[in-house]
């Protein structure tokens, strides 16, 4: 069946642990990418930033797992009103960040 | 200001009971969830329990399950913790803290009281 | 149940700089908290959710948390920063807050 919110925020919290973990030389190349709020509708602005970085296998599976998240389809060159425009950032800081939002999310129970 | 009082330390025998309360003033109470932790003489800090903050839920550390309860009474601001079948072991200053209160029970602790010490000796 | 492991001492020469380390297998996937504690006294909050600062503690104090270790970095450190100092964590899948044992700093 389906596996259920929580189990999939945990698995995708652990991935970004194994990412930030493992950086041996510079994430994805050192690729910058667009900062995002970290508000409602997060998911969808996540991967909307993270699909642009194309070649970067390191974030292949948190782009399918963040896909998980977003209830719409995400393609390269999309942007919502959540990216913060003026603003790029190192892919290994995005994910920093990203991590530690979501272990705040996983704490209030907000799992979707 | 926001200060958490802790009293019914003492000594007491193996195998007895003893209750400790700690007293809240200078917040909002009701709102926090409620920890004991407790630390032996020269020994590191070790978790005793929580009480959420409407008091709907309890959890506690494998040393003291079965053995303690923590109870709260909003209307009082007090927080109690009943310990029965007092053992050597349980020797410690027992500390109350409050930690907002999520979901989950993963907030650090804000707020410590000065402890209480329990001496369980024959 | 959670096992969060740090050195039992560290030794720093004043206006060094100290790191105190608090492992565990994916730490980074929790939140951690770190206390100080001075002899007599109860603990006092550092740092909490992994790097973050309580308003009262000077910006000397910093933390960071990455895949199974997370530490505590104290800047310039003072003959007052002298104390017992504990990481912290909520186990999720037992339900239990898991103290580390902790780390004695002493500034020679």
């Known amino acids: 069946g389906p596996v259920p919110p929580s189990t999939a925020l945990r698995e995708l919290i652990e991935e970004l642990v194994n990412i930030t973990q493992n950086q041996k030389a510079p994430l994805c190349n050192g690729s910058m990418v667009w900062s995002i709020n970290l508000t409602a509708g997060m998911y969808c602005a996540a991967l909307e930033s993270l699909i642009n970085v194309s070649g970067c296998s390191a974030i292949e599976k948190t782009q399918r797992m963040l896909s998980g998240f977003c209830p719409h389809k995400v393609s390269a060159g999309q942007f919502s009103s959540l990216h913060v425009r003026d603003t790029k950032i190192e892919v290994a800081q995005f994910v920093k960040d990203l991590l530690l939002h979501l272990k705040k999310l996983f704490r209030e129970g907000q799992f979707n | 200001q926001m200060q958490l009082v802790e009293s019914g330390g003492g000594v007491v025998q193996p195998g007895r009971s003893l209750t400790l309360s700690c007293a809240a003033s200078g917040f909002e109470f009701r709102t926090y969830g409620m920890h004991w932790v407790r630390q032996a003489p020269g020994k590191g800090l070790e978790w005793v329990g929580v009480i959420w903050d409407d008091g709907s839920n309890t959890h506690y550390a494998d040393s003291v399950k079965g053995r303690f309860t923590i109870t709260r009474d909003n209307s009082k601001n007090t927080l109690n913790l009943q310990m029965n079948s007092l053992r050597a072991e349980d020797t410690a200053v027992y500390y109350c803290?409050?930690?907002?209160?999520?979901?989950?029970?993963?907030?650090?602790?804000?707020?410590w009281g000065q402890g209480t010490m329990v001496t369980v000796s024959s | 149940s959670y096992i969060l492991t740090q050195p039992p001492s560290v030794s720093v020469a004043p206006g060094q700089t100290a790191t105190i380390t608090c492992g565990g297998n994916?730490?980074?996937?929790?939140?951690v908290h770190w206390y100080q504690q001075k002899p007599g006294q109860a603990p006092v909050l550092v740092i909490y959710?992994?790097?973050d600062r309580p308003s009262r503690i000077p910006e000397r104090f910093s933390g960071s948390n990455i895949g199974n270790t997370a530490t505590l970095t104290i800047s310039d450190v003072e003959e007052g920063d002298e104390a017992d100092y504990y990481c912290?964590?909520?186990?999720?899948?037992?339900?239990?807050?898991?103290f580390g044992g902790g780390t004695k700093l002493t500034v020679l």
């Open positions: 959710d992994d790097s």
């Open positions: 912290q964590v909520w186990d999720y899948s037992s339900d239990t807050m898991v």
């Open positions: 803290a409050r930690a907002p209160q999520w979901y989950l029970t993963a907030e650090a602790f804000d707020l």
């Open positions: 994916l730490i980074g996937a929790k939140l």
